[in-house]
């Protein structure tokens, strides 16, 4: 699987999950998030050669098409597969709120 | 929606579904598919600016991150959202077989 266990331990050029730390205040301008200060959102990148973690029949077909027609602009793209939530603390007035934001952390990638 | 109805009628630079005809024999080397000769597989391409048909909270965050940090390599990617099946005819020896291949035709795209 193209997950953090594999990708973070290997120098992988092809589609894989990459570490990306996002600071809410500095990188997003989200001053309202009090905790955490930031988090590892991670992201997916890298070429999608034929059959690499193909998401659907279409991505398999497109990967083969791209292999046999290398000048073509159509090719699968490396995108998130498994995502995890992130729990944040913020305030509404003086009242603290805790909320779980879904799909915030990329754990693995796929070619779609 | 970034679907064929919208994308095929507009000159859209950002993420959209694009027409792509694939000939099974010529483009894929699949001699075993006898009908159809080929089909519109289509593909997704184009930049994913902040909030454009964002698939998850992560793609929204990444889109914003990329807007505020334009030098960053991390950005959402334009990939298939809705896909449709394709029915094909092939032969196993002298016996005709009809099979519905799932997720073969891209009907719309999203930023993931």
């Amino acid at each position: 699987a193209l997950d953090t266990n594999y990708c973070f331990r290997n120098l992988e050029e092809n589609c894989c999950v990459r570490p990306l730390y996002i600071d809410f205040r500095q990188d997003l301008g989200w001053k309202w998030v009090h905790e955490p200060k930031g988090y590892y959102a991670n992201f997916c990148s890298g070429p999608c050669p034929y059959l690499r973690s193909a998401d659907t029949t279409h991505s398999t077909v497109l990967g083969l098409y791209n292999t046999l027609n290398p000048e073509a602009s159509a090719s699968p793209c490396c995108v998130p597969q498994d995502l995890e939530p992130l729990t944040i603390l913020y305030y509404v007035g003086r009242t603290p709120k805790v909320e779980q934001l879904s799909n915030m952390v990329v754990k693995s990638c796929k070619c779609s | 929606a970034l679907d064929t109805n919208y994308c095929f009628r507009n000159l859209e630079e950002n993420c959209c579904v694009r027409p792509l005809y694939i000939d099974f024999r010529q483009d894929l080397g699949w001699k075993w598919v006898h009908e159809p000769k080929g089909y519109y597989a289509n593909f997704c391409s184009g930049p994913c600016p902040y909030l454009r048909s964002a698939d998850t909270t992560h793609s929204t965050v990444l889109g914003l991150y990329n807007t505020l940090n334009p030098e960053a390599s991390a950005s959402p990617c334009c990939v298939p959202q809705d896909l449709e099946p394709l029915t094909i005819l092939y032969y196993v020896g002298r016996t005709p077989k009809v099979e519905q291949l799932s997720n073969m035709v891209v009907k719309s795209c999203k930023c993931s």
């Epitope: - | 001699k31 006898h34 009908e35 029915t87 005819l89 032969y91 196993v92 020896g93 002298r94 016996t95 005709p96 009809v98």
Partner: antibody, heavy 119, light 111 residues
Amino acid sequence: EVQLLESGGGLVQPGGSLRLSCAASGFDFNSYGMSWVRQAPGKGLELVADIVSKTYNYTTYYSDSVKDRFTISRDDSKNTVYLQMNSLRAEDTAVYYCTVAPGGSFDYWGQGTLVTVSS
Amino acid sequence: DIQLTQSPSSLSASVGDRVTITCRASQSVSISRFNLMHWYQHKPGKQPKLLIYRASNLASGIPSRFSGSGSGTDFTLTISSLQPEDFATYYCQHSRESPWTFGGGTKVEIK
């Protein structure tokens, strides 16, 4: 260009044997099923024997009229298909065509070879 | 085995005539939306030639005056305007199941 060249036909006595050959070129012979179709004088086309590719274990078919007397075989290294005809009868007199069916239709045909069974 | 019955078995027509030949199968030769019936032209001393494959698809190099239609058990070959070179015997053939079989043929003669 697809070419199918039959040979081996001729005059033979009832009960005798003949071996027809069909040399193929211009297509991926290994991938496709090959057939022998005949036309007896004043009659229609009849599929006599058929052999599919190695992918499908060289499965063969014979019409009831030739079963146990005719044998179809192929040599993929030589791009050739054969029809071994034993215990020939007068009713086997016909033009024999070699043909290739990439799908469900016989797309290409040889020029035919005449087999005459007569005493 | 699936039997194919062609009608008429012979016909006389003139150059320029519209000619229709039918082929009826003893059971359906269609599977899903695919119609597994094919048509051939056969002239004396020549090898048969594929005209139409899968009911309605014109084979390579065949003039557009030839057309095919039908589904299930009933199929038609039409020559829109008969030409001198079209006088021949026409056969239908199915590939719905093994064994593939031919129809008895329809001889098109000059009136």
